[in-house]
């Protein structure tokens, strides 16, 4: 059963390591994959003393942990590298950090990407 699924055909692309990896630094990435597989967008970033440093953004292969996520939100508490994935075109354009502890109320730390 799949409810309200939004197909992902393209994602915002960014690579902080673009010179070494010989890729573009930024752009729009078309997402390719098998017909029977879902596609997602992702973003990964670091928080260096309160400053957001994007590591990568782009397409992500079919991954059940990305299903039904319309927004790109990291919910893990204090990760070393932040990661989120989502479904829908360019859904990784904005990403946020909402740590959700087991007992305490979630706090909101929205992130504005600055490639």
């Amino acid at each position: 059963a799949i409810l309200g699924r939004s197909e992902t055909q393209e994602c915002l692309f960014f690579n902080a390591n673009w010179e070494k990896d010989r890729t573009n630094q930024t752009g729009v990435e078309p997402c390719y994959g098998d017909k029977d597989k879902r596609r997602h967008c992702f973003a990964t970033w670091k928080n260096i003393s309160g400053s957001i440093e994007i590591v990568k953004q782009g397409c992500w292969l079919d991954d059940i942990n990305c299903y039904d996520r319309t927004d790109c939100v990291e919910k893990k508490d204090s990760p070393e590298v932040y990661f989120c994935c989502c479904e829908g075109n360019m859904c990784n354009e904005k990403f946020s950090y909402f740590p959700q502890m087991e007992v305490t109320q979630p706090t909101s730390n929205p992130v504005t990407p600055k490639p």
Epitope: D34, D36, K37, D63, I64, N65, C66, Y67, K75, Q100
Partner: antibody, heavy 118, light 111 residues
């Protein structure tokens, strides 16, 4: 520490029903897809069912489709497997597993035994 | 119906190296199937060894490594130890929510 604790197993007659529960702690349950995996006595592991973070997408192995229903209650940090029209071949230890990015099972419960016999 | 195949059994001498493989009937295994490997000893829950083809799970010794060999996923154990004697399962993620387990390999450490 991540913990997954299954319950609800037991002896049931063919055609009967059981509801398994998996109580999760030590991680943000609502942020993880979850699965059920089973193991018949002396046999290998078999994936049974998976559910997405919201519960909006559910998946089943062919042999249980239409008989088993997976669900989750994110407010209670609990995963469920409703098993109806049980058959002898459903006899197995049922494990609850947390699914992480790259769609792998990163944590497992200790399992609960379901025996279908008359 | 996808069938994932593993060697039913394998033997290795203590200190030796063994490579277990994982293939399937519908073509070649690639990294896009996110191959993962699990170890299980009798009466215990499975333990995660390798995910995403070649990433070791936390706490797993570096004697265990994952790769793609030809058209199969592979788990290599170098410097095999007595307590490596277990059942080993691979899992392929077929996409669209579907996981498929291999039949498992029973590894015997001789001696």
């Amino acid at each position: 520490e991540v913990q997954l604790l299954e319950s609800g197993g037991g002896l049931v007659q063919p055609g009967g029903s059981l509801r398994l529960s998996c109580a999760a702690s030590g991680f943000t349950f609502r942020n993880s897809a979850m699965s059920w995996v089973r193991q018949a006595p002396g046999k290998g592991l078999e994936w049974v069912s998976s559910i997405s973070v919201t519960g909006g997408s559910t998946y089943y192995t062919d042999s249980v489709k239409g008989r088993f229903t997976v669900s989750r209650d994110n407010s209670r940090n609990t995963l469920y497997l409703q098993m109806n029209s049980l058959r002898a071949e459903d006899t197995a230890v049922y494990y609850c597993a947390k699914v992480y990015y790259y769609s792998f099972f990163d944590y497992w419960g200790q399992g609960t035994l379901v025996t279908v016999s008359s | 119906q996808t069938v994932v195949t593993q060697e039913p059994s394998f033997s290795v001498s203590p200190g030796g190296t063994v490579t277990l493989t994982c293939g399937f009937n519908s073509g070649s295994v690639s990294t896009s199937y996110y191959p993962s490997w699990y170890q299980q000893t009798p009466g215990q829950a499975p333990r995660t060894l390798i995910y995403n083809t070649n990433t070791r799970s936390s706490g797993v010794p570096d004697r265990f490594s994952g790769s793609i060999l030809g058209n199969k996923a592979a788990l290599t154990i170098t410097g095999a130890q007595a307590d490596d004697e277990s059942d080993y399962y691979c899992v392929l993620y077929m996409g669209s929510g579907i996981h498929v387990f291999g039949g498992g390999t029973k590894l015997t450490v001789l001696g």
